[in-house]
């Protein structure tokens, strides 16, 4: 019995659903009563899911697996794994026994995009040329371990005096902290790039340091030039700092965070007290850091509706304000591919291939190509619909006339995260039946 699985690992984002494809060729007169199907972990042989005696025996794997019952009779033994976790990563064996039998293993590669790095300086004020500063680049909740690169404003790699640590949390996701020690010149830009090797996703941030003259008491309000990119559901820090004058006390500080366009109050600190969040109770200051001039705002459980510009207004004796942009993003799921019609296909037939990817933000860019990498632009219709949370579901339809055989790939790109999610379908053999990937 020929059991077929994809050669390449199935890449799944943490929290999304993954389909482990497995197909077999049913013999004439085959009935489900004859089918025995076992999915198990390749290494430990732990049972994951099974079908026997004409019945789905259910999930033996945390109730997160399912078969495609309507497709089993056509030879589709694929397994749906829901709410993927880091611990799911590894090899799964699909064992099919009818009269003949066979098995094959498919690899699941789990991934999670890294957040846009935040940059901190120590010391962060009264800097002068010749001072040694420690620049820390931190990026959160990614998988697998990241590759971290530093470079200066001219793009020259900085490799000396770099220490990188990666710690996994209970979910197995990594927080990356990379520390660069440099001696300041007259001024300089330092960039940190955090790469997810599986997703080929690069997240980068930079900091420009202009050494200051002695403080005069003037309030210089500083925010990052680049937008702060935050994943939906995560927390974001809108950085804002000012230079406290000598003898400054928090009793003198008046701090207002508000939406730049509508002037809606978000959070304030005045009369020596944190006045609290005026923005759905999802904001917080860093009270222990205010006295050092850190007026940053923490925005919790980021939503698509939070996207936009936030103004940080500081008034002591002098006053100043600056606006920081929040760019919200959500990774797109690995596309699922469906064919219509999906059986008895012959060269010359016109088929409709649908590529669907879910719950991303902002709107995606969709690209189709053939097995040789040649772009397919004709007869493509793409629609993107936002749900109540503002996340987009993408459906792209390609109409093609079949050749003797062919591979059709769909790539869904998140333009903000620079995250590419792709799916492909190979149509071979005549006549043939396609077991669709769900």
């Amino acid at each position: 019995l020929e059991v077929q699985v994809p050669e390449d690992p199935v890449v799944a984002l943490v929290g999304t659903d993954a389909t482990l494809c497995c197909s077999f060729s049913p013999e004439p007169g085959f009935s489900l009563a004859q089918l025995n199907l076992i999915w198990q972990l390749t290494d430990t042989k732990q049972l994951v899911h099974s079908f026997a005696e004409g019945q789905d025996q259910g999930s033996a794997y945390a109730n997160r697996t399912a078969l495609f019952p309507d497709l089993l009779a056509q030879g589709n033994a694929s397994l749906r794994l829901q709410r993927v976790r880091v611990a799911d990563e590894g090899s799964f064996t699909c064992f099919v026994s009818i009269r003949d039998f066979g098995s094959a293993a498919v690899s699941l590669q789990v991934a999670a995009p890294y957040s846009k790095p935040s940059m901190t300086l120590e010391p962060n004020k009264d800097l002068r040329p010749g001072d040694t500063v420690t620049i820390t680049c931190s990026s959160y909740q990614g998988y697998p371990e990241a590759e971290v690169f530093w470079q200066d404003g001219q793009g020259v790699p900085l490799t000396g005096n770099v220490t990188t640590s990666q710690m996994a949390n209970e979910q197995g996701l990594f927080d990356v902290h990379s520390i660069l020690r440099v001696v300041l010149g007259a001024n300089g830009t330092y960039s940190c790039l955090v790469r997810n090797p599986v997703l080929q996703q690069d997240a980068h941030s930079s900091v420009t340091i202009t050494p200051q003259r002695s403080p005069t008491g003037a309030v210089e309000v500083q925010v990052p030039e680049d937008p702060v990119v935050a994943l939906v559901g995560t927390d974001a820090t809108l950085r804002c700092s000012f230079s406290p004058e000598p003898g400054f006390s928090l009793a003198q500080l008046n701090l207002i965070w508000q939406l730049t366009d509508t002037k809606q109050l978000v959070h304030s600190f005045t009369e020596g007290r944190d006045q609290g969040s005026a923005y759905a109770n999802r904001t917080a200051l860093f009270p222990d850091l205010l006295a050092q001039g850190n007026a940053s705002l923490r925005l919790q459980r980021v939503r698509v509706a939070d996207e936009g510009s936030f103004t940080c207004f500081v008034s002591i004796r002098d006053f100043g304000s600056a606006a920081v942009s929040l760019q919200v993003a959500a990774p797109y799921s690995k596309p699922s591919m469906t064919l219509e019609p999906n059986k008895d296909l012959r060269p010359g037939d016109t088929v409709t291939i649908t590529c669907s990817s879910y719950r991303g933000y902002p709107e995606a860019e969709v690209f189709w190509q053939d097995g040789q990498g040649v772009p397919l632009t004709g007869n493509v219709t793409t629609s993107q619909m936002a749900n109540e949370q503002g996340l987009f579901d993408v459906h792209s339809v390609l109409r093609v006339v079949l050749g003797a055989n062919g591979t059709y790939s769909c790539l869904v790109r998140n333009p903000v995260l620079q995250q590419d999610a792709h799916g492909s379908v190979t149509i071979t053999g005549q006549p043939m039946t396609f077991p669709p990937e769900a």
Partner: antibody
């Protein structure tokens, strides 16, 4: 002694322009935000515009936005207000004031009169 | 029409205590400190109270300020004839991104 001295007021026709100056002395000018506040004859105080110590941030009342421009020259310890497209309702005594804690204004000039009339 | 509302006038006799109110909203007095100014006839305004209740040096302790919610008040005890002046409250309004004044209260000392 801390002092602010306004100048540049006068009579101007509607639609005309005028530039007010405020010379500061007796304190580190660049360490303080500065304001322009006006008072029409027989009326109350109206805040017009403000500028941060470095000049990097500026603020305007809606009534003058797009017509007035505040600026400062810290090397000359001088604050300016460029007033364009003047209207009769801009007629007032214009005061410059030094920014203070809690959004206050602790030092005021003696004022300069701007009259917009044909 | 001023963002902060003050009574146009108030009066009292020497030695009396008078109070001047200033009413605003959540985006100004409700969330930011209040300052008070005294303007004697023909002169520039002078800072009288800052940060709701603090007196700059040189201001007599007969003048006091307080704030509650979206309102503030200036109290003058032991009224003197030289207190006859216009009094203005002022705050910062976050929804306007600007400083705002009350319309002013003319205080008359009788007798």
């Amino acid at each position: 002694e801390v002092q602010l001295l306004e100048s540049g007021g006068g009579l101007v026709q509607p639609g005309g322009s005028l530039r007010l100056s405020c010379a500061a002395s007796g304190f580190t000018f660049s360490s303080y935000g500065m304001h322009w506040v006006r008072q029409a004859p027989g009326k109350g105080l109206e805040w017009v515009s403000a500028i941060s110590g470095s000049g990097g941030s500026t603020y305007y009342a809606d009534s003058v936005k797009g017509r007035f421009t505040i600026s400062r020259d810290n090397s000359k310890n001088t604050l300016y207000l460029q007033m364009n497209s003047l209207r009769a309702e801009d007629t007032a005594v214009y005061y410059c004031a030094r920014g203070y804690y809690y959004y206050g204004m602790d030092v005021w000039g003696q004022g300069t009169l701007v009259t917009v009339s044909s | 029409q001023s963002v902060l509302t003050q009574p146009p006038s108030a009066s009292g006799t020497p030695g009396q205590r008078v109070t001047i109110s200033c009413s605003g909203g959540s985006s100004n007095i409700g969330s930011n400190p209040v300052n008070w100014y005294q303007q004697l006839p023909g002169t520039a305004p002078k800072l009288l109270i800052y940060g709701n209740n603090k007196r700059p040096s040189g201001v007599p302790d007969r003048f006091s300020g307080s704030k509650s919610g979206t309102s503030a008040s200036l109290a003058i005890s032991g009224l003197r004839s030289e207190d006859e002046a216009d009094y203005y409250c002022q705050s910062y309004d976050s929804s306007l991104s600007g400083w705002v004044f009350g319309g002013g209260t003319k205080l008359t000392v009788l007798g």
